[in-house]
């Protein structure tokens, strides 16, 4: 079945490379496993960012390497990607998978445009 | 639950045609995205072809003018008719659900695009050969 996901359409990155985002979505049951998924979409490809899964009501867990971090509440996810750089510059896609108990669940979101800017570097003081 | 089912593979030489359908139950889905995907021996899976609620239709450009893709809403079936096979053809066929409409038409453009589908039939093997 599918579900409406939805997210912010532009956010700006801090100037040390962080980018915070809500990815909300309409659960039409009661989900108690729900894995979600940063996709990033630019020059015509499509990447995955990072994923975890998680039990309604505790906190998600990525791997120890990834650039994200997040917290869930209800329906709704606060994601944080971190180490942004202007290359990163991009379309951040939340997906969203109810994975139990089933019937599976899939939404996508319309995208987040994360922009990134690299900080100026300090001039040399004389 | 969702389940799709491909059907119409099978081994043809190389100018022939086959016709692929994809028959789905469980899920009401004429209001979203519905494509064609093939992954080749060693290779990653790749889209073919996507057609939206409103019937508009986008080709990879390695199908373009060969391959025709269609869909039935009252018996809940997608059809890819293949005309000219190559032997570059040669694939297993997948036909997916994408949920959201906004990823449907630049699909076959995008490399990776199946990160945007779900619900994944089991798949048909279309082998040319002569």
């Known amino acids: 079945k599918a579900m409406h996901v939805a997210q912010p359409a532009v956010v700006l990155a801090s100037s040390r490379g962080i980018a915070s985002f809500v990815c909300e979505y309409a659960s039409p049951g009661k989900a108690t496993e729900v894995r979600v998924t940063v996709l990033r979409q630019a020059d015509s490809q499509v990447t995955e960012v990072c994923a975890a899964t998680y039990m309604m009501g505790n906190e998600l867990t990525f791997l120890d390497d990834s650039i994200c971090t997040g917290t869930s509440s209800g329906n709704q996810v606060n994601l944080t990607i971190q180490g942004l750089r202007a290359m990163d510059t991009g379309l951040y896609i939340c997906k969203v998978e109810l994975m139990y108990p089933p019937p599976y669940y899939l939404g996508i979101g319309n995208g987040t445009q994360i922009y990134v800017i690299d900080p100026e570097p300090c001039p040399d003081s004389d | 639950e969702v389940q799709l089912v491909e059907s119409g593979g099978g081994l043809v030489q190389p100018g022939g045609s086959l016709r692929l359908s994809c028959a789905a139950s469980g899920y009401t889905y004429s209001r979203h995205c519905l494509g064609w995907f093939r992954q080749a021996p060693g290779k990653g899976r790749e889209a073919v072809s996507t057609?939206?609620?409103?019937?508009?239709?986008s080709y990879a450009d390695s199908v373009k003018g060969r391959f025709t893709i269609s869909r039935d809403n009252a018996k809940n079936t997608l059809y890819l008719q293949m005309n000219s096979l190559r032997p570059e053809d040669t694939a297993v066929y997948y036909c997916?659900?994408?949920?959201?409409?906004?990823?449907?038409?630049?699909?076959?453009?995008?490399?990776?695009?199946?990160?945007?589908?779900?619900?994944w039939g089991q798949g048909t093997l279309v082998t040319v050969s002569s």
């Open positions: 997916a659900i994408g949920p959201n409409p906004r990823y449907c038409s630049g699909a076959p453009a995008t490399r990776g695009a199946e990160h945007y589908f779900g619900y």
């Open positions: 057609i939206s609620s409103g019937g508009s239709t």
